[in-house]
């Protein structure tokens, strides 16, 4: 029998302890939120907020400008000064809760935990390829706001998510805030609201539409807003909240809330429970039917998918998919599965399920006992009745009221449990060629860039490397600028190439040449590298014979 070279075990063909140095910026405090801007004339910026300060960085992470956003009441606070002579309320530190781009102007909007959660608008002033912030505008009109009616009170100290949508000649802010009794009593931020930014940037228009957790539920029923995004005709919020109003706080689960992006109304507000599970190939005795539930969403991102994953998900290439990282939750008993699982929810399917749920509620034959739900926002009722009514009213439409869809959307872990003990804390998904890549940050300060494929029993790594020695968790906010992603960990912001930081972690020529084409890896004498790192021969087609 002919002798063959011994096979190198797969795990031995790569080394994830290889050190990669990626550009970074020290922000001088824990990074609270971050967003990037790419203009149409090659100007770009990274905006980074820490307590009491907002940094403007170039795409190379060099500092361009810095602005004092607090403490409120401090004479050095530059944003506070935009609101005119004070006092404007209790003094204290400003934690930035919202940092979003208003793309139509363009401008940056920041909202903090101080000064009743008001926002500031910073026009973007391009200077060559750099971007500066103009003097801030205070989006707050003192005489328009009262504790019980405050259109300009946007951010909650407990957390707020905002998505900005351009409709006609106006910008609408879709706002979702976590509340408790104390926050609700103080200048009344709302749970979910749609607010129009006034054209003169004096604040937000009055009489905005909103939903809020009812006062009687505020103590026990808290909603965490994990992510928000706009795609197609809708804005979506992702929440973690008690599964039951009556048993709250109790067990948690994850919901998707859908709002119209074309009409600033909340009558067609819909919620759907998202169910993510780990279903091992071989089910252990005593393991739950249908797989082990992972009910708590940690992070999420929506992106169009490449051809390979699209085929596996039975959808068309380029369709938008919501990816979520889920964990088991505190009360789920001793876990035998992975720490984190990743589920994929195609947006079109989500929309179809929601629309079918509306039909079930509103079209005859009426399903007896079907609840409208959302009892934490509105009076309990059965379909097709409006909230709080025992019977349908002739001049109200069943469809014009918020609804919790009666079915849930169930998916299983894309990685088949292969993330193991890894605790994912950040997620950003990109499409590269026909491949879909999940860029994940972890609780121990690492970046994992992994090809998303359903059918494999191993992880297809683009990279797996440590951002530094601090080992601090990578934060939820991830932003993209060109071919780079920006991750934050502790007080640092890191710039990570989408195609991976390098190829040196591939140890064998065979493994090197099997790397995805977009990574640009080739064999370079005795190591795997990119062409520009290679002074000698660089080979992407075949390996030298092993002697």
């Amino acid at each position: 029998k002919e002798w063959q070279c011994p096979r190198t075990p797969y795990a031995a063909s790569r080394d994830f302890n290889v050190k990669y140095m990626v550009p970074s910026f020290s922000a001088g405090g824990l990074v609270q939120t971050m967003v990037t801007y790419q203009g149409d004339k090659n100007e770009s910026a990274v905006f980074v907020a820490i307590r009491n300060r907002l940094h403007v960085l170039g795409p190379d992470l060099k500092s361009v400008q810095s602005l004092a956003t607090g403490p409120a009441g401090d004479p050095g606070c530059q944003t506070c000064a935009a609101c005119g002579p004070g006092p404007h309320g209790p003094s204290g530190d400003t934690d930035t809760k919202v940092l979003v781009l208003e793309p139509a102007l363009p401008a940056l909007v920041s909202c903090g935990s101080s000064l009743q959660g008001r926002c500031f608008l910073h026009d973007l002033d391009p200077q060559g390829t750099a971007v500066h912030l103009a003097a801030p505008a205070c989006l707050f009109s003192a005489h328009h706001n009262r504790p019980d009616d405050c259109p300009d009170c946007v951010a909650s100290p407990l957390g707020t998510r905002v998505t900005v949508v351009e409709q006609g000649q106006a910008s609408y802010f879709y706002v979702a805030s976590s509340l408790d009794a104390a926050v609700a009593a103080s200048f009344s931020p709302r749970s979910v609201s749609i607010r129009r930014l006034k054209a003169d940037a004096s604040g937000f228009a009055p009489g905005f539409v909103a939903l809020s957790v009812l006062p009687k539920h505020l103590v026990s029923y808290s909603i965490e807003y994990v992510h928000s995004f706009h795609t197609g005709a809708f804005v979506y919020f992702l929440t973690v909240q008690p599964a039951s109003v009556t048993d709250a706080p109790g067990a948690l689960h994850t919901r998707l809330a859908r709002l119209s992006a074309t009409e600033p109304e909340l009558g067609d507000y819909r919620e759907l429970v998202l169910d993510c599970r780990f279903a091992p190939k071989r089910r252990r005795r005593g393991a739950p039917e249908g797989g082990q539930p992972y009910p708590v969403l940690r992070v999420a991102h929506s992106a169009p998918v490449g051809a390979q994953l699209a085929t596996e998900l039975s959808i068309a290439e380029g369709q938008e998919v919501l990816f979520g990282v889920f964990v088991a939750g505190k009360d789920s008993g001793p876990g035998v599965g992975p720490n984190s699982v990743v589920c994929a929810f195609p947006i079109d399917l989500l929309d179809t399920l929601i629309d079918e749920g509306v039909e079930r509620c509103c079209e005859s034959p009426v399903h007896p006992g079907l609840r409208r739900g959302l009892d934490f926002f509105q009076s309990p009722s059965f379909c097709p009745n409006p909230p709080g009514l025992e019977a349908p009213s002739p001049n109200t439409s069943c469809r014009h009221f918020p609804l919790l869809v009666s079915s849930s959307f169930s998916r299983v872990d894309l990685f088949n449990g292969l993330l193991g003990t890894v605790e994912v804390t950040a997620l950003y998904v990109t499409r590269l060629d026909n491949v879909t890549v999940a860029h994940m940050g972890t609780a121990d300060g690492r970046i994992l860039q992994v090809e998303l494929a359903r059918s494999l029993n191993y992880l297809l790594y683009v990279s797996n490397f440590s951002l530094g020695d601090s080992g601090q968790p990578v934060q939820r906010d991830v932003s993209r600028l060109g071919d780079h992603l920006f991750f934050a960990s502790g007080d640092q912001v890191f710039q990570v190439p989408i195609q991976g930081p390098g190829c040196r972690h591939f140890l064998t020529c065979g493994r090197c040449l099997r790397a995805q084409r977009f990574m640009g890896c080739g064999w370079c004498g005795n190591m795997c590298g990119r062409q520009k790192e290679c002074p000698g021969s660089w080979q992407q087609d075949h390996c030298p014979p092993k002697l």
Partner: antibody, heavy 116, light 109 residues
Framework: EVQLQQSGPELEKPGASVKISCKAS????????MNWVKQSNGESLEWIGD????????RYNQKFKGKATLTVDKSSSTAYMQLKSLTSEDSAVYYC?????????WGQGTLVTVSA | DIQMTQSPASLSASVGETVTITCRAS??????LAWYQKKQGKSPQLLVY???TSVEGVPSRFSGSGSGIQFSLKINSLQPEDFGSYYC???????????FGGGTKLEIK
């Protein structure tokens, strides 16, 4: 559909006052400021001022302070502009225009003629 | 107050030609600029806002550009219905009241 319907033409004597109206429909009247703009014959457009129908707050171009007074009637979704101490300089077409990034919605204009 | 200087005050062009109207602000107004078309006896029509955002339903031959203090409106391949007056407008933004440029009368050659 957003519509702004203005009152008809006015012929006034010098020294008199005139009040023109702008009735809004197709949107939430109190949610948007109402602007007023003047165009004299063959001249450019001039912004007179605006009013916030929800709170009643007004802002004026310095040139029109004391000349124009802006008010609203929320119950009828109507904005008004009164011009006082009329002179021939006030002869012009006056437009109402809804707040926005740029004024996308205009009334059809009201011609005010001041003549002895 | 911000002054808006529009040029030229008038121009004549033929159908099919391309024309450019410019507007200069006396100070930085970022992208807070709108353009209108005004015909005799009609209300102004918004063409462009935020310096370069075209209004839905406005023909694509109208395009705005610029930021800061210098702005322009370009009309490609002039059509007979494009003749009239054009105005730039410093949009309302914090602390700055709206101001119109002096206008450009576009006539048929």
């Amino acid at each position: 559909e957003v519509q702004l319907q203005q009152s008809g033409p006015e012929l006034e004597k010098p020294g008199a006052s005139v009040k023109i109206s702008c009735k809004a429909s197709g949107y939430s009247f109190t949610g948007y400021n109402m602007n007023w703009v003047k165009q004299s014959n063959g001249e450019s457009l001039e912004w007179i001022g605006d009013i916030d129908p929800y709170y009643g707050g007004t802002r004026y171009n310095q040139k029109f302070k004391g000349k124009a007074t802006l008010t609203v009637d929320k119950s009828s979704s109507t904005a008004y502009m009164q011009l006082k101490s009329l002179t021939s300089e006030d002869s012009a077409v006056y437009y109402c225009a809804r707040e926005g990034r740029g004024f996308a919605y205009w009334g059809q204009g009201t011609l005010v003629t001041v003549s002895a | 107050d911000i002054q808006m200087t529009q040029s030229p005050a008038s121009l004549s062009a033929s159908v099919g030609e391309t024309v450019t109207i410019t507007c200069r602000a006396s100070e930085n107004i970022y992208s807070y600029l709108a353009w209108y078309q005004k015909k005799q006896g009609k209300s102004p029509q918004l063409l462009v806002y935020n310096a370069k955002t075209s209004v839905e339903g406005v023909p694509s031959r109208f395009s705005g550009s610029g930021s800061g203090i210098q702005f322009s409106l370009k009309i490609n391949s002039l059509q007979p219905e494009d003749f009239g007056s054009y105005y730039c407008h410093c949009q309302h933004h914090y602390g700055t009241l709206p101001t119109f440029g002096g206008g450009t009368k576009l006539e048929i050659k």
